[in-house]
């Protein structure tokens, strides 16, 4: 139980893509404000988003310090204009989030086809190396820097004139595929972490087709 007119947050949900991580909750505040705290299992609580009327809090800066840790957050509710007020147990009303392990759970962002180049009956398709907000020596790491060989890409490709799709896989960011001469092909890619049990795959990239600007053709 909390103070009069104060309700506990509920539906605490982690929204995370490529380690950009936001905690969301309900309800929209009426005469109350929120403060969020985040901690690792063995660490101290750190307060964020002080006395906010938002129902989300960006916790990216905290989780990117170590994406392989497991995190817990909690949302405190305070009466608006009386943030010192506490619940009947002598502390503010709060609700805990589910545990969140970024390395295992962050969604893979939609990849982008950087380029494709045809040489005769071969096409080289290159996927952009997506940047994350994880840092090392003041530089941002790519998805590959974080996941290494555990990150693969799946390429879907098909003749523009038909609907039958073929697939190829790579543990780099490049595909080299065989195509029929004189045919135009379309491509889409998907990032995959095969070792995961949840959030294994990204959404498909936008489709790119030969004969459009991204491509290059050489005899």
């Amino acid at each position: 139980s909390g103070t009069t007119n104060t309700v506990a947050a509920y539906n605490l949900t982690w929204k995370s893509t490529n380690f950009k991580t936001i905690l969301e909750w309900e309800p929209k505040p009426v005469n109350q404000v929120y403060t969020v705290q985040i901690s690792t299992k063995s660490g101290d609580w750190k307060s964020k988003c002080f006395y906010t009327t938002d129902t989300e809090c960006d916790l990216t800066d905290e989780i990117v310090k170590d994406v392989k840790q497991t995190y817990l957050a909690r949302v405190f509710s305070y009466p608006a204009g009386n943030v010192e007020s506490t619940g009947s147990a002598g502390e503010p009303l709060y609700e805990n989030s589910p545990e969140f392990t970024p390395y295992l759970e962050t969604n893979l962002g939609q990849p982008t086809i950087q380029s494709f180049e045809q040489v005769g009956t071969k096409v080289n398709v290159t996927v952009e190396d997506e940047r994350t907000l994880v840092r090392r020596n003041n530089t941002f790491l790519s998805l590959r820097d974080v996941f290494g060989k555990d990150l693969i890409y799946t390429l879907y490709y098909w003749k523009s004139s038909s609907s039958g799709k073929k697939t190829a896989k790579t543990n780099t960011n490049e595909f080299l595929i065989d195509v029929d001469k004189g045919e135009n092909y379309c491509f889409s890619v998907q990032a995959v972490i095969p070792s995961r049990t949840v959030n294994r795959k990204s959404t498909d990239s936008p489709v790119e087709c030969m004969g459009q600007e991204k491509g290059e053709f050489r005899e």
């Epitope: 299992k41 295992l104 820097d145 974080v146 060989k149 990150l151 960011n173 049990t197």
Partner: antibody, heavy 120, light 113 residues
Framework: EVQLVQSGAEVKKPGESLRISCKGS????????IEWVRQMPGKGLEWMGD????????NYSPSFQGHVTISADKSISTAYLQWSSLKASDTAMYYC?????????????WGQGTLVTVSS | DIVMTQTPLSLPVTPGEPASISCKSS????????????LTWYLQKPGQSPQLLIY???TRESGVPDRFSGSGSGTDFTLKISRVEAEDVGVYYC?????????FGQGTKLEIK
């Protein structure tokens, strides 16, 4: 402090089963690959396979696939290497190791090794 | 599978002198877009577990003395010790950390003359 502590030496007969263990501490066990490496007497290092405890996903060297099984119990931060039927040629030192923080950054921490002797 | 080949297999060195070990892989270990080579070096001292020296071909692991350096790209790599000390004796291994199955070189035994 990160530590990998392996179970003690074993002496077994051919055909017997065996499970050796590797307990991790001082880090988040579920998010780092645990590697298993064999070193036969007087020989070099051979990678056997690995497991990501958070999901149970495994990879095996073709040389060891089907002969050993790698598993983990994340509730007690322990990985296992097991044989259903040992051979004399399984006599070796077995090391577990933990992957580095960054992708493809090697085996940053190693256990002390478990010596397995298989002899009739 | 990627095959790793080290030379020499034995390396006698006088303390204070430099030492160099070569490692060749049967396929490129270069990840083009990150400009990283996924090649790792380990040292196994007598009677001990192996220890990580260098990852990404040239990045020293924390706590490894700066007399150790790694270089190379693609399929050809080198581990150099600028001035060998008595505590450097042991077997040095290179490893493919580019793709599964992971594979080690056969090892180079460094001994003091």
């Amino acid at each position: 402090e990160v530590q990998l502590v392996q179970s003690g030496a074993e002496v077994k007969k051919p055909g017997e089963s065996l499970r050796i263990s590797c307990k991790g501490s001082g880090y988040t066990f579920i998010t780092y690959w645990i590697e298993w490496v064999r070193q036969m007497p007087g020989k070099g290092l051979e990678w056997m396979g690995d497991i990501l405890p958070g999901s149970g996903s495994t990879n095996y060297s073709p040389s060891f696939q089907g002969h050993v099984t790698i598993s983990a119990d994340k509730s007690i931060s322990t990985a296992y290497l097991q044989w259903s039927s040992l051979k004399a040629s399984d006599t070796a030192m077995y090391y577990c190791a933990r992957s580095g923080y960054y992708g493809n950054s090697g085996f940053a921490y190693w256990g002390q090794g478990t010596l397995v002797t298989v002899s009739s | 599978d990627i095959v790793m080949t080290q030379t020499p297999l034995s390396l006698p060195v006088t303390p204070g002198e430099p030492a160099s070990i070569s490692c060749k892989s049967s396929q490129s270990l270069l990840y083009v877009y990150g400009q990283k080579n996924y090649l790792t070096w380990y040292l196994q001292k007598p009677g001990q577990s192996p220890q990580l020296l260098i990852y990404w071909a040239s990045t020293r692991e924390s706590g490894v003395p700066d007399r150790f350096s790694g270089s190379g790209s693609g399929t050809d790599f080198t581990l150099k010790i600028s001035r060998v000390e008595a505590e450097d004796v042991g077997v040095y291994y290179c490893q493919n950390d580019f793709s599964w199955p992971l594979t080690f070189g056969q090892g180079t035994k460094l001994e003091i003359k």
